[in-house]
C-alpha cells in the first residue's frame, strides 16, 4: 500500500473556487488536515508557493491528468495515492457548487475524503466511512470519523504521539544569577528558549518572569545529559539535538526513531570528534555549526554542507572569538554565549551589537 | 532493477493484426498504471493506450480508438497491445512505459522499454 | 482539448552553452508537465516532473519552471551527452520535441 514515508507533509491550495471566500476554504482545509493529523503523528503545513506534497487545485473537464471532470454532479473530485509529482494530489471539480453548509457539496466532508486518499487510503465498502466512495451530507460541525477510517489510517501511520509535557524536576539546582553560569547549549523551541547544563535544562518564554527547569531524562529518556549543541528548524517544528559524535532529531517533542545518527552524514570530516555550538538561521535557510575555531555551514534545503566550509570563526564573524558555547537565533539576532558572557550579533551587518551576562535572559 | 522488455513487433499488411508484448520486471507490477507509445520514424512521441493496475479502466488516443485493445496479465507481470485493422500510419517503434500506481492515472512515464518495431506495409 | 506547444522545433548551441526550451499549453495544466530527454535509437527518459522536480540520477544542470500554461527546460551548461531530442508532456499530450544539435 502506498503511504508517505515522512511525518511532516506540506500542502498548497494552488487556486480557489469562486463559489466560496478564500479564508473559508482555507480554513475548511486547515480541518480537514486536521481530522487526520488528530489520529496520527502526520503534522501538514501550508505553503503560499513552490510544490507541496499535496496539491490541491479546482479545475473543469481536462486539467491535466488523464482524468476528466464530468461536469456538475457524477465526480465530484479525485485524488493520487502518495508519491512525488502529481501523487498526493487533490482535485475538486470546479463546476460543482462547493458550500459550507449542507447545500450544493459540501467541501469539508469531500476534502476530508480526498485527503484520505492523499494519504493512502482507499475506499471503504462501510457506509459510515468517509472513505465511502458515495457522498453524503454529514454535519461537519459533529463530523467524526468511523472506527473503521481510524484504524485504515492508524494502520499506515500509527496513533498519534502526544508530546510529553515539561514537568519541574524535585532538587533545581541552584541560582541562575550565579556570576559564572554557562550553558552547554541553548535554542528556541517553538516559543519558548531552551537553556541546556548537564543532565537538566531550563526553559522559559521570553518577556516572563517565570523560570522553569526539567531533567533531560524526565521528558526524552533516550537523550543522554552533556548535549553540547542544539537548534531548531521552527517551520518543521524540529529539534536537533547534538553530543560528541552523534545526534539526534526530536519531532514535535517526540525523539524520532532510528536516531541517534552519525554527524559524520551530514558532511563533517572526521577531524571533527564534537559540535561546540549550532544554530539555524531561518531567513537565509541555513545551519551555522561552531567546531573549535572554524564554522560549517549547512543547507537544510538540500540537505548538503556548503562547499569550501570550514571557515575561520574569526574572519568571518568580526569581534568573535573561539571559543562558543552556544548561539541562539532569536529576532534576527544571534546570541553567541561564551563562558558567563554573551554577545549579540548582528549578522546583517556583521558585526556584536551587545554584551551581555549570559544569564540576562532570567532577569539577572 | 526496472526492466519492460517489449516483443511482438514484425511486418504486417494494411488492415491485419498483430499483439504486442510487454514483460516487466525488477518492480511489482499489479498496483501501477502502465501506457504503450508509439514514434513514428523520424517524428515525435505519441501515447497510444494505457490501462490501470487492475486492467478494469483502459484510455486510447483517438487515432487507434476500436482498433487496439490494451489488455494486462498481472500474475505474468505482462502488459499488452492487439492491434486490428492496421493502417500504413501505424507504423513506429511501440515502447511501453510505466505510469504511477493508484486509482488515477497522470501519465508520468518513469521507466520505459527500448521498444519494438511494427511495420505496415504493402 | 489541451495542446502542448514546444519552440523551438531545432536548437544549434556548443558546449558550455545556457539553453532554454519553452512549452506552452492552450490551457491551464497547473504543474502537471513532464519532461524527457530522447537519443537517437534510444528510448525516452524521464528528465524532470511535475514543471519542476528533478528525477533520480539526473544532473543538477537540467531544470524547470512554470505552471499553468508557460512551462521552460533549461540546461545551465550544456555537456557533449545533452545533444539529444527534448519532449515537453502532460497526461496522453506531448510537444512536438526539440531537437538539440551541435553548433
Known amino acids: 500500500r502506498s503511504r508517505w514515508m515522512k511525518r511532516y507533509l506540506t500542502y498548497r491550495i494552488y487556486n480557489y473556487t469562486p463559489d466560496m471566500k478564500r479564508e473559508d476554504v482555507d480554513y475548511i482545509f486547515q480541518k480537514a488536515f486536521q481530522v487526520w493529523s488528530d489520529v496520527t503523528p502526520l503534522r501538514f503545513r501550508k505553503l503560499h508557493k513552490d510544490e507541496a506534497d499535496i496539491m490541491i487545485l479546482f479545475a473543469f473537464g481536462a486539467h491535466g491528468d488523464f482524468n476528466y471532470f464530468d461536469g456538475k454532479g457524477g465526480t465530484l473530485a479525485h485524488a493520487f495515492y502518495p508519491g512525488p509529482g502529481i501523487q498526493g494530489d487533490a482535485h475538486f471539480d470546479e463546476a460543482e457548487t462547493w458550500t459550507k453548509s449542507f447545500q450544493g457539496t459540501n467541501l469539508f466532508l469531500v476534502a476530508v475524503h480526498e485527503l484520505g486518499h492523499s494519504l493512502g487510503l482507499q475506499h471503504s465498502n462501510n457506509p459510515k466511512s468517509i472513505m465511502y466512495p458515495t457522498y453524503r451530507y454529514l454535519n461537519p460541525s459533529t463530523f467524526r470519523l468511523s472506527a473503521d477510517d481510524i484504524r485504515n489510517i492508524q494502520s499506515l501511520y500509527g496513533a498519534p504521539v502526544k508530546p510529553p509535557s515539561l514537568t519541574k524536576p524535585s532538587s533545581p539546582p541552584s541560582t541562575f544569577c550565579h556570576q559564572s553560569l554557562s550553558f552547554d547549549a541553548v535554542t528556541t523551541v517553538g516559543e519558548k528558549i531552551f537553556f541546556f547544563k548537564d543532565w537538566f535544562f531550563w526553559w522559559k518564554l521570553p518577556g516572563s518572569p517565570a523560570t522553569n527547569i526539567t531533567s533531560i531524562s524526565s521528558i526524552w529518556p533516550s537523550i543522554p545529559s552533556g548535549i553540547q549543541a542544539a537548534y531548531e528548524i521552527e517551520s518543521r517544528n524540529q529539534l536537533f539535538l547534538f553530543k560528541d559524535e552523534k545526534y539526534w532529531l526530536i519531532n514535535n517533542l517526540v525523539p524520532e526513531p532510528h536516531y541517534p545518527r552519525s554527524i559524520y552524514s551530514l558532511g563533517f570530516s572526521a577531524s571533527v570528534k564534537k559540535v561546540d555550538a549550532a544554530v539555524f538561521d531561518p531567513l537565509r535557510q541555513k545551519v551555522y555549526f561552531f567546531v573549535d575555531k572554524h564554522y560549517w555551514r549547512y543547507d537544510v534545503r538540500q540537505e548538503l554542507m556548503d562547499p569550501a566550509y570550514p571557515k575561520l570563526i574569526s574572519t568571518h564573524f568580526p569581534g568573535i572569538k573561539p571559543k562558543i558555547d552556544a548561539v541562539l537565533y532569536f529576532k534576527r539576532h544571534y546570541y553567541i554565549f561564551q563562558g558567563a558572557y554573551q554577545l549579540e550579533y548582528d549578522p546583517l551587518f556583521r558585526r556584536v551589537t551587545k554584551t551581555l551576562k549570559s544569564t540576562s535572559w532570567f532577569g539577572c | 532493477e526496472v526492466q519492460l522488455l517489449e516483443s511482438g513487433g514484425g511486418l504486417v499488411q494494411p488492415g491485419g493484426s498483430l499483439r504486442l508484448s510487454c514483460a516487466a520486471s525488477?518492480?511489482?507490477?499489479?498496483?501501477?498504471?502502465m501506457s504503450w507509445v508509439r514514434q513514428a520514424p523520424g517524428k515525435g512521441l505519441e501515447w497510444v493506450s494505457g490501462?490501470?493496475?487492475?486492467?478494469?479502466?483502459?484510455f486510447y488516443a483517438d487515432s487507434v480508438k476500436g482498433r487496439f485493445t490494451i489488455s494486462r496479465d498481472n500474475s505474468k507481470n505482462t502488459l499488452y497491445l492487439q492491434m486490428n485493422s492496421l493502417r500504413a500510419e501505424d507504423t513506429a517503434v511501440y515502447y511501453c512505459a510505466k505510469d504511477i500506481r493508484g486509482a488515477y492515472s497522470s501519465g508520468l512515464f518513469d521507466y520505459w522499454g527500448r521498444g519494438t518495431l511494427v511495420t505496415v506495409s504493402s | 482539448d489541451i495542446q502542448m506547444t514546444q519552440s523551438p522545433s531545432s536548437l544549434s548551441a556548443s558546449v558550455g552553452d545556457r539553453v532554454t526550451i519553452t512549452c506552452r499549453a492552450n490551457q491551464s495544466i497547473y504543474t502537471y508537465l513532464n519532461w524527457y530527454q530522447q537519443k537517437p535509437g534510444k528510448a525516452p527518459e524521464l528528465l524532470i516532473y511535475a514543471a519542476s522536480s528533478l528525477q533520480s540520477g539526473v544532473p543538477s544542470r537540467f531544470s524547470g519552471s512554470g505552471s499553468g500554461t508557460d512551462f521552460t527546460l533549461t540546461i545551465s551548461s550544456l555537456q557533449p551527452e545533452d545533444f539529444a531530442t527534448y519532449y515537453c508532456q502532460q497526461a496522453g499530450i506531448f510537444g512536438q520535441g526539440t531537437k538539440l544539435e551541435i553548433k
Open positions: 525488477g518492480f511489482t507490477f499489479s498496483p501501477y498504471w
Open positions: 490501462i490501470s493496475p487492475s486492467g478494469g479502466i483502459t
